[in-house]
């Protein structure tokens, strides 16, 4: 559910990506959200996406569990009281495992129609 | 002060299912999940599955995945948590909860008062 | 799933010991990882939360401790009525897990 009493998410960046785990960084006004709530799902899988959720004054937080060499998409939304904004998303393949960190390979965001890639 | 009130106790035959219900009062539902809880007699806790009403989509630990349902009235406040093909193992005390952390940062835990489901021939 | 391991599963104390019991996570879990007490009879009370937040209304004499995959309990001095089962529980990844718990009997 979304509402136009809801501001907005402002941006979602991938700032480090490892062979298991990234650290997601994202934008959002200052105390508007309960909490934040974050869906990992693995591209072109049946499987059911893993769900976390962070505290609304949070901007950042690690995910961890993921799998290497791997094509996932984040998509976070803020929550508050019965409201949920629109979800922004994220397209982003994990490291092979050869190096702890790489630069993100891929990085996507996108809310409504409009499309950011940033290589 | 939020309080959970959940349904009387049941007894079931093996291979049926049962529902049991949890009514949320004194608080926001939508946007807390409520988790599931068991307790088999002596044993430990286990963790069933979670729901966030707003999001309606439940998360359900691997050993129940297919067997049970847990689903969300936004409109009476009220989660429900279905187990299916049940067997004597399955008796034990059933809680629903709204626990800090997944989608809850509040001061609090709460817990309704569990639900015993005898299964039983 | 994430498996949560802890130990002693019982273990049999006298009143002013020092108590600590392990959880272990099987990969690392994002701290939201709380600690819980239960009585027979009676829904879990929660004593920590956040690895080392105390509860309010709960005794200093439980804290908490550890980072990543490995996560203590520590009682600093066992009184009469912390006689009980203890858990742990991460909720920070779903689906949430509990460890199987540790009894602490009287000696």
């Known amino acids: 559910a979304s509402t136009g009493e809801t501001p907005n998410l402002g941006e979602v960046v991938v700032a480090e990506v490892g062979w298991d785990a990234l650290k997601l960084n994202w934008t959002a006004p200052e105390g508007a959200y309960e909490y934040f709530f974050i869906q990992v799902q693995e591209a072109d899988t049946v499987e059911a996406a893993q769900n976390l959720t962070v505290p609304g004054g949070l901007r950042s937080t690690d995910l961890p569990g993921l799998k290497a060499a791997t094509h996932y998409t984040i998509t976070i939304r803020g929550v508050t009281q019965d409201f949920s904004t629109t979800p922004l998303s994220v397209e982003v393949l994990t490291a092979s495992g050869l190096n702890d960190i790489f630069e993100a390979q891929k990085i996507e965001w996108h809310e409504g129609t409009h499309h950011h890639h940033h290589h | 002060q939020v309080q959970l009130v959940q349904s009387g106790a049941e007894v079931k035959k093996p291979g049926s299912s049962v529902k049991v219900s949890c009514k949320a009062s004194g608080g926001t539902f939508s946007s807390y999940a409520i988790s599931w809880v068991r307790q088999a007699p002596g044993q430990g806790l286990e963790w069933m599955g979670g729901i966030i009403p707003i999001f309606g989509t439940a998360n359900y630990a691997q050993k129940f995945q297919g067997r049970v349902t847990i689903t969300a009235d936004k409109s009476t406040s009220t989660a429900y948590m279905e187990l299916s093909s049940l067997r004597s193992e399955d008796t034990a005390v059933y809680y629903c909860?709204?626990?800090?952390?997944?989608?809850?940062?509040?001061?609090?835990?709460?817990w309704g008062q569990g639900t015993t489901v005898t299964v039983s021939s | 799933d994430i498996q949560m391991t802890q130990s002693p599963s019982s273990l049999s104390a006298s009143v002013g010991d020092r108590v600590t019991i392990t959880c272990r996570a099987s990969q690392s879990i994002r701290n939201v990882l709380g600690w819980y007490q239960q009585k027979p009879g009676k829904a879990p009370k929660r004593l920590i939360y956040?690895?080392?937040s105390l509860q309010s209304g709960v005794p200093s004499r439980f804290s908490g401790g550890g980072s990543g995959t490995e996560f203590t309990l520590t009682i600093s001095s066992l009184q009469p009525e912390d006689f009980a089962t203890y858990y742990c529980?991460?909720?920070?990844?779903?689906?949430?897990?509990f460890g199987q718990g540790t009894k602490v009997e009287i000696k």
């Open positions: 909860a709204r626990l800090y952390g997944y989608a809850y940062y509040g001061a609090f835990d709460y």
């Open positions: 529980l991460q909720n920070g990844l779903q689906p949430a897990t």
């Open positions: 956040d690895v080392s």
